[in-house]
């Protein structure tokens, strides 16, 4: 299953696959996510190692059992691969990193006004993997403001140095935020020139393509058709690159297909992993399993549940079937692409569904009446959990947020639906950031079911959560995927780095505003805020965010929505905007339902609804 | 130049047998995945049945399962489909078409045959 | 078997018009998605495959577009000889299935 905890001054020892530099533990865990052998990881901080060399050093890691020894080591930090953990797959990564300079080919400088621009114009630059930018403080004056657009043969730094007033991080390509454009042309009977930067065999082109765009380097593809003239070169799958980012060349080629990977697409990039299954096609690897199962999709699932697998055959020859049930090879690569394809047989081929991020139909869980006052502008998929809970009556309008929790579930509060319990009346837009981009064209979700607190009454603070069961479920995006939810009763975590996001007003006798607002706010303590709300019981099942100087908080419309805090690398919903004094007010925090403390009704209801388990624990 | 072309079409009584042809030319037959695919009078398409071009596996559409066998000669260039236990439903015109590899859709396609299945 | 949901069924235009026909997967296809023009007593032609490649020779007014379970054919302006059947098929899963059919008419 999917497992998320990170282990502090710990290291694996052996199993090393790969090793290269990234700037912190959670970079590491995704490139071990998309390594195809990777399933453990180890990382040094600057500050856990006095070896220059070894510094930032990210250690890829894989293991027959599953699991290698740990020595301590102090500063390190150790984990597993996010492969089976559904929705937080992902390749995008937006930190930037202060005081580090991430080494690389230098192929553009500029000068730009702020680390945020240089990092745009990465992203929009189709060569860019990283940037580093020298603040306005830099010790040479020269190099003040200048940008550094990077690449490297990995896609990952060459060497990583501290180094004061320098900024660093990676282009936002992976989050679908390219200004570029790509290609969904593919091109049958043609072959690109240039550069080759891998060999895969891969079925069809379309695997093909998706591997193009996971790759670091590959910016087109060429793929060799099973009817290819050249025996040997049949299902070779060429990814590609050039100086200029295009193809140099293209020549008119029978049974060859090309076309580009799609990492510059805008809103959508594909699934990191393939679905199809292939008739008539056997795949050859290496041996990790054979396994009797009943059917095709079974043998998919068994080859996805146990995690080293990468693909498998299900072979439908009468000496590999007894009964019903028939032979699943269980197999694996160095490169997790088969090293054979053979068509006409009598098996079915595919891949694990490890790195799909839609995951299962669950809520996310991790085991172990009020808009944001004093916030700043929101980007694309920053918050991809946020929703907008609309009413359309004679007019339609936004009323509250919600956090989508899984493909069909929003957890929102109950005091959202006082005196409007209606289903029908309710429109629920997920993806979105401007409220403005809402046409009557924009896809929205309804309700198929309200399920509001039992104890639960209008009027008053206590168990203002609901939840709302979608018609259909939604598909997961880089800019629509869940928020997981606490750990039961969860107390002994200390949040550090928590947000309030929303659509509310700016002021108390302000308007809906168009962008989603962000607002990173601390916790305060159960007694404190007690002290506030003398006139009000703040219960354990609540918590309280604001600042004592008042200025930042949620308010009208942001009701709802969510507190989310960022612990170990990890989004976790902590609280629901519920209530407040006022917004903003000098020492009146705002009031939150403790998600953590009502786990066990969350599960229930989310299990109940569909009588089946929902529940996903990636940890 | 890429042709295929259907040909043993005809009118047949229900439960009677007819046998298809599809000879193939201009490229190399064994090679390709083939298909049958009909479509009745005033109808859409219905995928019938396919052959791998090695012959195996095969697959049919419910409907057609256990009544029809589709199998293909390499060395003549030519796709069959045999149909048995006609039905009335069964009318229709019948197409063969070529299924292009790895991106999956049919590239060429015969003109059809007609088979009417009537008392 | 997944299921081909094409709408609408008919549809009237004019010379010059934009188009847009969409067909609905029961399921995730990903871009396994084909488009097919067929005109009366002939075999279909191949328009767009992979849910929005332009199969070579097809004019350039006929686009492709979609992923996972909604796709869309659009015409950007109407010409005379467009104005007959059109069949999405999905290629994701054996047996290939096709969408009922859209009948583009003439206003």
């Known amino acids: 299953g999917c497992l998320t905890q990170l282990y502090e001054n710990a290291f694996f020892r052996g199993g090393d696959v790969a090793s290269m530099y990234t700037p912190n533990a959670q970079y590491c865990q995704m490139r071990c996510t998309f390594h195809p052998r990777c399933l453990l990881f180890s990382f040094l901080p600057a500050s856990s190692i006095n070896d220059m060399e070894k510094r930032f050093g990210c250690f890829l890691k894989d293991s027959v059992t599953g699991t290698l020894p740990k020595v301590h080591r102090t500063g390190a930090v150790s984990g597993h691969s996010l492969k089976q953990c559904g929705h937080q797959i992902s390749a995008c990564h937006r930190d930037i990193y202060k005081g580090v300079d991430m080494r690389g080919v230098n192929f553009n400088v500029s000068k730009v006004s702020s680390v945020e621009e240089c990092q745009k114009r990465c992203t929009s630059n189709i060569r860019c993997q990283f940037f580093s930018y020298a603040t306005q403080t830099f010790h040479k004056a020269e190099y003040r403001n200048n940008c550094l657009l990077k690449y490297s043969p990995g896609g990952t730094p060459t060497a990583i140095k501290v180094l004061s007033n320098v900024e660093s991080g990676f282009s936002l390509k992976p989050c679908a935020l390219s200004e570029i454009g790509c290609h969904m042309n593919i091109f049958q009977h043609l072959a690109f020139s240039d550069v080759d930067v891998a060999r895969v065999l891969t079925p069809d082109a379309f695997v093909c393509r998706t591997i193009c765009t996971y790759h670091p380097n590959c910016l087109f593809f060429t793929f060799y058709t099973n009817v290819w003239k050249i025996e040997s070169q049949r299902n070779v799958c060429l990814l590609k690159t050039s100086e200029s980012g295009t193809p140099s060349s293209s020549t008119p080629q029978e049974n060859t297909i090309s076309g580009y990977s799609l990492l510059t697409c805008k809103r959508t990039l594909p699934e990191p992993c393939h679905s199809k299954i292939y008739p008539g096609v056997d795949f050859g690897g290496e041996e990790l399993n054979v396994t009797f199962v009943k059917g095709v999709n079974v043998c998919q699932e068994t080859c996805t549940k146990m995690i080293r697998c990468q693909f498998f055959t299900y072979s439908l020859l009468p000496e590999d079937c007894k009964e019903e049930k028939c032979k699943c090879f269980l197999r694996l690569s160095m490169d997790g692409s088969p090293t054979r394809i053979a068509y006409g047989t009598q098996g079915s081929s595919g891949y694990s569904l490890r790195l799909c991020n839609t995951g299962d139909n669950s809520v996310c869980t991790t085991k172990t009446s009020t808009r944001i006052v004093g916030g700043t502008n929101s980007s694309w998929g920053e918050w991809p959990w946020q929703v907008s809970l609309q009413v359309k009556l004679t007019a339609q309008r936004h009323l509250c947020g919600g956090s989508l929790i899984g493909h069909q579930w929003v957890l929102t509060a109950a005091h959202c639906f006082d005196g409007l319990p209606l289903q029908d009346v309710w429109r629920i837009y997920s993806g979105i950031l401007n409220l403005s981009d809402i046409t009557k064209d924009t896809p929205f979700s309804q309700i198929k079911e309200i399920i509001i607190h039992q104890n639960y009454k209008v009027s008053e603070g206590n168990h203002d959560i609901a939840l709302i069961k979608l018609q259909a479920p939604l598909n997961y995006t880089e800019f629509q995927k869940p928020i997981c939810l606490p750990s039961k009763g969860d107390t002994s975590t200390i949040y550090t780095n928590c947000w309030v996001t929303g659509w509310g007003f700016s002021k108390e006798k302000g308007e809906i505003q168009n962008i989603l607002q962000k607002v990173n706010i601390p916790l305060v303590t159960n007694e404190e805020c007690q002290k506030r709300y003398q006139d009000y019981k703040i219960t354990q099942r609540m918590v309280c965010a604001g600042y004592k100087e008042g200025g930042k908080d949620a308010c009208k419309g942001d009701s709802g929505g969510p507190l989310v805090c960022k612990h170990n690398g990890m989004w976790r919903l902590v609280g629901i905007t519920s209530w407040g004094e006022g917004c903003a007010r000098r020492e009146q925090p705002g009031v939150y339902t403790k998600v953590a403390e009502y786990m066990d009704w969350i599960l229930e209801k989310t299990q109940s609804s569909d009588g089946k388990a929902q529940m996903q624990s990636p940890a | 130049e890429v042709q295929l072309l259907e040909s043993g079409g005809g009118l047949v009584q229900p439960g009677g047998s007819l046998r298809l042809s599809c000879a193939a030319s201009?490229?190399?037959?064994?090679?390709?995945?083939m298909f049958w695919v009909r479509q009745a009078p005033g109808k859409g398409l219905e995928w019938v049945s396919s052959?791998?071009?090695?012959?195996?596996?095969?697959m049919y559409a419910d409907s057609v399962k256990g009544r029809f066998t589709i199998s293909r000669d390499n060395s003549k260039n030519t796709l069959y489909l045999q149909m048995n236990s006609l039905r009335a439903e069964d009318t229709a015109v019948y197409y063969c078409a070529r299924e292009y590899p790895s991106t999956y859709y049919f590239d060429y396609w015969g003109q059809g045959t007609l088979v009417t299945v009537s008392s | 078997d997944i299921q081909m949901t094409q709408s609408p069924s008919s549809l009237s235009a004019s010379v010059g018009d934009r188009v847009t026909i969409t067909c609905r997967a029961s399921q995730s296809i990903s871009t396994y998605l084909n488009w097919y023009q067929q005109k009366p007593g002939k075999a279909p032609k191949l328009l767009i495959y992979g849910a929005s490649s332009l199969q070579s020779g097809v004019p350039s007014r006929f686009s492709g577009s979609g992923s996972g379970t909604d796709f869309t054919l659009t015409i950007s302006s109407l010409q005379p000889e467009d104005f007959t059947i059109y069949y999405c098929q999905q290629s994701y899963s054996d047996p290939y299935t096709f969408g009922q059919g859209t009948k583009l008419d003439i206003k």
């Open positions: 052959i791998w071009s090695s012959g195996g596996p095969t």
């Open positions: 201009g490229f190399t037959f064994s090679l390709y995945r």
